[in-house]
Interface confidence: low
């Protein structure tokens, strides 16, 4: 807001206008409009002569002004000459300018048809278990006016859930300064935002407009299962679909998915609707819109709709799931070399073929570096000649190989560890 | 929008779950769920046996999660063993997770109660003069069906000021299609934007809710005088104060300072209010607050309120705004020097002081780096000893300088040159 | 039954004065804007004045301005128009109307309910 | 000032026939405002139609009104022998046009 005070000099033209005189014969004036004023007004500039006289001063453009900077980008000059025949210490030129034409508009108003009452003020929330009273105050001036009166009120309370739109919000209306909302106005564990303003009753005297709305306030309703699927609405578009939407908690319905339910009559069977859309709705929830087809409004009026669980299965088949138990890894010494040997657990199933994965490395390489060999249905496998004096490790899997038959990599077996023998110097 | 089939895997543990038996004697699961879940909703690992037989299975918390990745930050991973005796190429496992409680709500939606009618579509302006003609059409489905009908319907048209809020808007009833809007709706040279909803008419059988708004549609007013103030409203609080509100092209405001005046009955002198408060409005307007005071509603019902060009005036006083007309200036020499010599035009008051500022420099300098001196009163002065052969340059100007008269200097008077004599040599 | 009944027609000469009077019965009279209405011998009907609820509106055609003025007393359930400066063309029935109520005074209801009028003649 | 035209000035017609009398005003008026009258010889005014459109208590159904901006229309569609008399509008408190007679042909 800014404010000015009637008289105070805010136009481009007096902000701009200087005049000076030569005390003798002639008195120039200097002023500027803009371009952008003048497409919609032209103002003249107005000399005062006396108290009844005004007096249009003949202005030309001008290149320049020296006498007073322009504050706007677009400013057109002017230069005006007033002769003047005699001057006096005491002398006051008083200058205004005035618009090309007359500009103004006109209201009479009836103050009883005028009216917009004073806008609530102090709107409190407090509760009382699971309801919550509105509270707030308004003035209306000293009590013995009485002009404008408590019966010539009434109040509009507005409320909604944080994340939805003031457009789509509630409305009570009170003739008293405060208002209940219960369980049948609110959802559980959810912000509420609520604001009020005072409106002419349909009773009184008086017309006019709604006060502003007064400050909001917010509260957390009546805690509940966070976890249910809330505000489920349908609504017939009156031809052929029933448009349903409900909210879910963002964190439930990542662990829990909803599904909506339909029954065209009580002993009809139930359906599950699809497509099911979806959109954020705030931080915390997502909302879900699905059309349930109404081929026959006239015979089926009456839909039982239901947002449930849905048995969302996952389909695991045995056969190519497999992991089998680790095997049981062993290395022996056949005289100069080594040979690994391992053992699987019995399968009851002798025809499934193994596939086994054995990695062996010195002690100071990685997994990651070790040597690795792929052996079909082989449960021993003859290491090559090893470095001496040398530490080495062993590790077998095994997966199943068989057509129709699949599932990934056992976990590996123990690893096994052993020392090759030093070699005798040849002297 | 995201879109998902019924049936679609969608939660996380659904997602994360991998399952793999070693064929032989049992089957061990993955899965995670969310700590933001958990605070709201446990779900158990199901496993259906068979068609009517649901397993609930035991779970343990996991470390790691070696099968699937998570697509949450907080996952809590799950470990879960299921004894199995046997095992046939052609099993296939059911798993599902469950909630701990029942989740869900219920709807009996009778069609009739739970109406929302189409929204308009096409919605068009077209105009004739100063009359603007919104239409629109609304698809009813299938002509045979009937179930919803015109009759049912009404339609709510809002059009406002592209700068002012829906909130604000005008509401205007149709029962057809088509809506006019003319000069009493319209402000001139404005640019409205209108939306249209359906809704049920209060006559119809049925009830619901209004349709959503249709896509909105813009245009321009009959044009008018745009230097016009616009929009004056005025509102009484129904105690002590009138609260009137205007509308300026900014444009304008700057070159026109309108003010608020009013008169408490049609005989009563005409006041202006004070003070303006001004607020940008869009990019082309200003709107002004005044408030107007109601002493007595009772006895003054009836207040002439207009806004009007002010007559704000600059008053110039003559004898502290004075510009001399600029001397006349000559150059004389005198023996081996020069003066310098100006008259100023006769003023009719002889008691005037005045003051000279003189200036004179070498051709090669700049009046930026020439001598200056001030002298009072005096009308000529003798310049010191010059440099020889050499071409210079002479200006004077004039300011009032008695107290009680005041004003800036002349302009310069036209500047004059002379040539100084060579010197002759000393041999 | 709503009924409203005037009184105080008559002849008068040009320049002379006259009160007209409005009894209102069946309903409350203060909650009304009731209006003067004219009718020339042979013409058309000419609203002449109104005057709100509570006294404080007034409103008068142009032909009767600063002739004509309306009044009413809602304690005695009275409107009043005093006429002075009458001219011939002034001669006329005239009919006191309520207008129709409504708590917006946007909105007009008509003027519902008319009494049976009263004859004033100006002539010399 | 506005004003309203009325017409045709009469009107001659049989009983049973339709009646369609116009209003019309010199600049655009809410219907919100506009109402009609029936006047017969010897009486007060009567209120047919109020908002352009609505009907005062009492008026039978054949008299309905219609339009908006500048032209408006009193329609009775089935004249009776006690409908005929003198129609006029009026716009808001003030302005009435100058009556259509609708006499009997």
């Known amino acids: 807001w800014e404010r000015s005070l009637a008289g105070a000099e805010e136009t481009i033209p007096l902000q701009t206008l200087r005049c000076y005189n030569d005390y003798t014969s002639h008195i120039t004036c200097r002023w500027a409009d803009t371009q952008d004023a003048q497409r919609l007004v032209n103002v003249t500039l107005i000399r005062r002569v006396n108290e009844d006289l005004l007096e249009p001063v003949s202005c030309d453009l001008s290149d320049d002004m020296p006498w007073s900077a322009c504050p706007h980008p677009r400013c057109v000059p002017r230069r005006c000459v007033i002769p003047c025949q005699s001057f006096v210490v005491t002398d006051v030129d008083y200058f205004s300018f005035q618009p090309d034409r007359p500009l103004g508009t006109r209201l009479t108003v009836t103050l009883t048809q005028h009216v917009q009452p004073p806008e609530p003020r102090d709107l409190q929330i407090s509760t009382d278990q699971d309801h919550f009273l509105l509270t707030w105050s308004v003035a209306l001036g000293s009590p013995q006016s009485h002009w404008l009166s408590p019966g010539d009120l009434e109040f509009e309370v507005v409320y909604k859930r944080l994340q939805d739109s003031w457009e789509d919000a509630a409305i009570l209306l009170s003739n008293t300064s405060q208002a209940t909302l219960g369980p049948e106005h609110l959802m559980p564990s959810s912000t509420y935002v609520a604001r009020v303003r005072t409106r002419l009753a349909p009773g009184s005297r008086l017309s006019g407009r709604p006060s502003k709305w007064s400050p909001e306030v917010c509260w957390d309703s009546q805690p509940g299962d966070e976890a249910q699927p809330q505000n489920l609405e349908c609504f017939f578009d009156g031809a052929a679909v029933l448009s349903c939407s409900w909210e879910v908690r963002k964190e439930v319905a990542s662990s829990v998915s909803f599904g909506l339910f339909y029954k065209p009559s009580p002993d009809a069977g139930e359906e599950e609707c699809s497509p099911v859309l979806r959109e954020g709705l705030g931080s915390l929830h997502t909302r879900h819109h699905c059309q349930i087809p109404v081929p026959d409004p006239a015979t089926h009026g009456q839909y039982i709709v239901s947002v449930q669980p849905r048995r969302a299965e996952k389909h695991i088949k045995s056969s190519v799931n497999i992991q089998m138990a680790p095997p049981s890894l062993n290395v022996t010494k056949d005289g100069d070399s080594y040979s690994l040997r391992w053992e699987t657990m019995k399968m009851r199933y002798e025809h499934i073929d193994h596939t086994f994965e054995i990695q062996y490395r010195k002690d100071t390489a990685t997994w990651k570096d070790s040597k690795t060999e792929t052996l079909q249905n082989a449960h021993s496998m003859a290491l090559p000649a090893l470095e001496p004096s040398t530490r080495y490790w062993a590790r077998v899997r095994v997966r199943t190989s068989r057509t129709g038959y699949n599932g990934i990599w056992s976990e590996w077996s123990e690893a096994r560890s052993w020392d090759t023998e030093s070699v005798l110097p040849m002297w | 929008w995201e879109r998902s089939l019924a049936g679609a895997e969608e939660t996380i543990p659904l997602q994360t779950l991998r399952c793999y038996n070693d064929y032989t004697s049992h089957i061990t699961c993955r899965w995670a769920d969310t700590q933001d879940a958990q605070r709201l909703v446990n779900v158990t690992l199901i496993r259906r046996v068979n068609e009517d037989l649901l397993e609930p299975v035991s779970c343990d918390l996991s470390d790691d999660m070696p099968w699937s990745a998570c697509p949450h930050p907080r996952c809590v991973p799950r470990r879960c063993v299921i004894p199995c005796q046997s095992f046939v190429v052609t099993d296939v496992d059911y798993f599902s997770f469950q909630p701990d409680r029942p989740l869900g709500t219920r709807l009996t939606v009778t069609l009739t109660q739970h109406v929302q009618p189409p929204e308009p579509r096409d919605l068009q302006i077209s105009t004739d003069q100063d009359h603007f003609l919104l239409t629109w059409s609304v698809a009813l489905g299938s002509p045979q069906s009937h179930w919803l009908s015109p009759g049912d319907l009404e339609f709510e048209v809002v059009y406002k000021r592209l700068q002012d809020s829906w909130e604000d808007a005008a509401i205007l009833l149709s029962n057809t299609s088509q809506a006019t809007l003319g000069p009493e709706h319209l402000m001139p040279s404005s640019t409205y934007v209108a939306r249209v909803r359906t809704r049920l008419a209060p006559g119809s059988r049925l009830s619901g809710r209004p349709s959503k708004w249709s896509p909105e549609v813009c245009w321009d007013s009959q044009p008018g005088d745009e230097a016009q103030p616009q929009n004056l409203e005025c509102f009484f609080d129904g105690a002590a104060v009138l609260s009137c509100s205007w509308e300026v092209r900014k444009e304008v405001a700057s070159s026109v300072s309108f003010g608020l005046f009013y008169k408490p009955s049609p005989d009563a002198g005409e006041e202006e209010c004070s003070p303006v408060l001004r607020e940008g409005l869009g990019s082309l307007h200003t709107r002004h607050h005044c408030q107007i005071p109601v002493p007595d509603p009772a006895t003054h019902g009836q207040y002439i309120v207009s806004v009007q060009p002010r007559r704000a005036e600059k008053h110039i006083k003559s004898s502290v705004n004075i510009q001399m007309a600029p001397p006349s200036l000559n150059v004389t020499k005198d023996g081996d020097s020069y003066s310098l010599r100006w008259e100023t035009m006769k003023m009719r008051y002889e008691h005037i002081d005045h003051t000279f500022e003189i200036q004179y420099r070498k051709d090669t300098a700049t009046w930026k780096d020439s001598k200056t001196e001030t002298l009072q009163n005096a009308h000529s002065m003798a310049l010191p000893a010059l440099e020889p052969s050499t071409r210079y340059w002479a200006r004077v100007r004039v300011r009032t300088s008695r107290t009680g008269y005041n004003g800036i200097w002349s302009e310069w008077s036209e500047a004059r040159s002379w040539d100084t004599e060579s010197v002759l040599p000393m041999w | 039954q709503v009924q409203l009944v005037e009184s105080g027609g008559g002849l008068v000469k040009p320049g002379g004065s006259l009160r007209l009077s409005c009894a209102a019965s069946?309903?409350?009279?203060?909650?009304?804007?009731m209006s003067w209405i004219r009718q020339a011998p042979g013409k058309g009907l000419e609203w002449v004045s109104f005057?709100?609820?509570?006294?404080?509106?007034?409103y008068y055609a142009d032909s009767v301005k600063g002739r004509f003025t309306i009044s009413r007393d809602n304690a005695k359930n009275s409107l009043y128009l005093q006429m002075n400066s009458l001219r011939a063309e002034d001669t006329a029935v005239y009919y006191c109307?309520?207008?129709?109520?409504?708590?917006?005074?946007?909105?007009?209801?008509?003027?519902?309910?008319w009494g049976q009028g009263t004859t004033v003649t100006v002539s010399s | 000032e506005i004003v309203l035209t009325q017409s045709p000035g009469t009107l001659s017609l049989s009983p049973g026939e339709r009646a369609t009398l116009s209003c019309r005003a010199s600049?655009?008026?809410?219907?919100?405002?506009l109402a009609w009258y029936q006047q017969k010889p010897g009486q007060a005014p009567r209120l047919l139609i109020y908002?352009?459109?609505s009907r005062a208590t009492g008026i039978p159904d054949r008299f309905s009104g219609s339009g908006s901006g500048t032209d408006f229309t009193l329609t009775i569609s089935r004249l009776e022998p006690e409908d005929f008399a003198v129609y006029y509008c009026?716009?808001?408190?003030?302005?009435f046009g100058g009556g259509t007679k609708v006499e009997i042909k």
């Open positions: 109307a309520r207008r129709g109520y409504s708590g917006y005074d946007y909105y007009y209801y008509g003027l519902d309910v």
């Open positions: 069946g309903f409350t009279f203060s909650d009304y804007y």
């Open positions: 005057i709100s609820s509570s006294g404080i509106i007034i």
């Open positions: 600049q655009s008026v809410s219907s919100s405002y």
């Open positions: 908002g352009a459109s």
């Open positions: 009026q716009q808001y408190g003030s302005t």
